[in-house]
Interface confidence: low
């Protein structure tokens, strides 16, 4: 007996072939011997079964001796043994219909759990293997659980249900509500305008919620709220903003904040949170600001950075077109009695320059 796996709500073809490649009499029946469909002349006839309005056959294939039964909008209860009678022979096909659904909304916040539940016919013992868009493989039986969703789990999940060495594949679209990046760092010279961007890793037709940016300046003992805002149908409106610094916010997505000037007292790290309407929990993105200042005071040329820098970053002072360089894995470097000329202060990571500031040292006569 042939086994065919189908998907709930889908279409399945149960094949029945005759040796003669021409129209011939055929009937499909269920295990209770109730007629589902058959042929009468060139017409397709339907029997009294519950399937009759969802069962069909493709006439164009009859001339090839193929008398398939196509069952549309499959239900779990369609699982049964079907009998094709053609040319005085009987062919049996066992159809097993499975359904795989997400227990909750398929739009989930990063860190939330996803549970997929398999509906299966009585007496079956299927196994399920799911592959996330990021390539993560998860196996299970009647349920599959992903305890903590990550942003790379967003997209189409491919789940394979196996039974009797046969497989059927489901695709479930999961949207993980998160920012594109967990963290980002902006490097700026003192006095420059700072742009913070918080692109979302998903798109929704209607996006409503509220958010806030908390900031922990390196020099400050506690964090403070820099800005709060509302989001209504992808339109951003500022609710409250501090006087110092006076942030500006874009009215459209992606969420965009402008700090008029990068100053050492603003260097530090922030946490932007976004609470979406009808969703429990919040989206988070960390943002860091690193500020550089190069100064000359009397016989001392100093370069300093403020903000969260990794210990492996190198700060250098270098005289343009000359070999004179001082480098340190520190937050400040200096040169006593610097030569006249254009000096460069460089913050770099393994040779890649992250931030650069130039300062001209004039000759002292």
């Amino acid at each position: 007996k042939k086994v065919v796996l189908g998907k709930k709500g889908d279409t399945v073809e149960l094949t029945c072939n005759a040796s003669q490649k021409k129209n011939t009499q055929f009937h499909w029946k269920n295990s209770n011997q109730i007629k589902i469909l058959g042929i009468q002349g060139l017409f397709l006839t339907k029997g009294p079964s519950k399937l009759s309005d969802r069962a069909d056959s493709r006439k164009s294939l009859w001339d090839q001796g193929c008398f398939s039964m196509i069952i549309k909008n499959l239900k779990i209860e369609d699982s049964d043994t079907y009998i094709c009678e053609v040319e005085n022979k009987k062919e049996e096909v066992e159809l097993l219909v499975f359904g795989l659904t997400a227990n909750s909304d398929t739009h989930l916040l990063e860190g939330q759990s996803l549970t997929l539940t398999l509906e299966s016919p009585p007496g079956s013992s299927p196994s399920v293997k799911c592959r996330s868009p990021g390539g993560k493989n998860i196996q299970g039986g009647r349920t599959i659980s992903v305890p903590q969703l990550e942003r790379q789990d967003s997209g189409t999940w491919t789940c394979t249900v196996s039974q009797d060495q046969k497989t059927v594949e489901f695709k479930i679209d999961i949207v993980v509500l998160a920012f594109q990046k967990a963290s980002s760092t902006v490097y700026k010279k003192e006095g420059e305008q700072v742009e913070f961007s918080f692109p979302l890793a998903f798109t929704l037709e209607k996006l409503t919620g509220s958010g806030e940016l908390w900031w922990q300046a390196e020099r400050a003992s506690s964090s403070k709220s820099w800005i709060t805002f509302d989001l209504k149908n992808k339109e951003v409106s500022v609710k409250r903003v501090t006087q110092d610094p006076k942030l500006q916010m874009g009215k459209k997505l992606p969420l965009h904040l402008t700090l008029p000037q990068a100053l050492p007292q603003y260097a530090g790290s922030g946490n932007l949170t976004l609470a979406l309407e009808a969703k429990t929990g919040k989206l988070h993105q960390e943002v860091n600001l690193v500020v550089m200042r190069a100064t000359q005071f009397q016989e001392n040329l100093t370069c300093e950075v403020w903000g969260p820098t990794s210990p492996k970053l190198t700060l250098s002072l270098k005289l343009e077109n000359k070999g004179a360089t001082v480098s340190k894995q520190a937050k400040a470097v200096w040169v006593l009695n610097p030569e006249a000329g254009m000096w460069q202060c460089l913050l770099s990571d393994s040779g890649q320059v992250l931030l650069e500031s130039n300062i001209k040292v004039v000759p002292t006569w």
Partner: antibody, heavy 116, light 107 residues
Framework: QVLLEQWGAGLLKPSETLSLTCAVY????????WTWIRQPPGKGLEWIGE???????NYNPSLKSRVTISIDTSKNQFSLKVKSVTAADTAMYYC??????????WGQGTLVTVSS | DIQMTQSPSSVSASVGDRVTITCRAS??????LAWYQQKPGKAPKLLIF???SLQSGVPSRFSGSGSGTDFTLTISSLQPEDFATYYC?????????FGGGTKVEIK
């Protein structure tokens, strides 16, 4: 058994639009990504792109600017259009279905020749 | 894009010979690899999926092995109907890519 039957114009002039259609018979239509693959004469296989029953598409970046894949779920058909064709688009075009991740079954193929 | 490099590009063999074709991915693709057979004028046919699983109806003389970046298709005892071109394909990431092909010819 799933049967893929494809058709479309076989001879085109440069700058014209290639148009092919693939009909899916007998098998599952929803839940899969329906795919187009091409093979220039005497060369290897190149994945063009895919579409699912919801109309979600993925394209090969090398062709994305010229390619459109669309779907008609009411007819269990999906189509390929390639605009501004050149001789480099001369190939055998196949429609296929990734069953899980692997292409099976395939259409019979349609040879498209671009010549002035 | 993940590049798939097949070697050799062609191989001459006799009926009964053991033939080995290799495929190398430009990055780790775990076991997301398939092998296809294509005969002139025909569509490719799936032989092996998930690097080593034999597709239903494919003779057991075909086998696949490998993981990560290096993969092998072996035909244990070449039959007349096996003279064809063989392609590997990665399903790890978009765009899906194929190897350049290996033509198995009669010696």
């Amino acid at each position: 058994q799933v049967l893929l039957e494809q058709w479309g114009a076989g001879l085109l002039k440069p700058s014209e639009t290639l148009s092919l259609t693939c009909a899916v018979y007998g098998g599952s239509f929803s839940g899969y990504y329906w795919t187009w693959i091409r093979q220039p004469p005497g060369k290897g296989l190149e994945w063009i792109g895919e579409i699912n029953h919801r109309g979600s598409t993925n394209y090969n970046p090398s062709l994305k600017s010229r390619v459109t894949i669309s779907i008609d779920t009411s007819k269990n058909q999906f189509s390929l259009k390639v605009k501004s064709v050149t001789a480099a688009d001369t190939a055998m075009y196949y429609c296929t279905r990734p069953d899980s991740n692997w292409f099976d079954p395939w259409g019979q193929g349609t040879l498209v020749t671009v010549s002035s | 894009d993940i590049q798939m490099t097949q070697s050799p590009s062609s191989v001459s063999a006799s009926v009964g010979d053991r033939v080995t074709i290799t495929c190398r991915a430009s990055q780790d693709i775990s076991n997301w690899l398939a092998w296809y057979q294509q005969k002139p004028g025909k569509a490719p046919k799936l032989l092996i999926f998930a690097a080593s699983s034999l597709q239903s109806g494919v003779p057991s003389r075909f086998s696949g092995s490998g993981s990560g970046t290096d993969f092998t298709l072996t035909i244990s005892s070449l039959q007349p109907e096996d003279f064809a071109t063989y392609y590997c394909q990665q399903a790890n990431s978009f765009p899906l890519t194929f190897g350049g092909g290996t033509k198995v010819e009669i010696k």
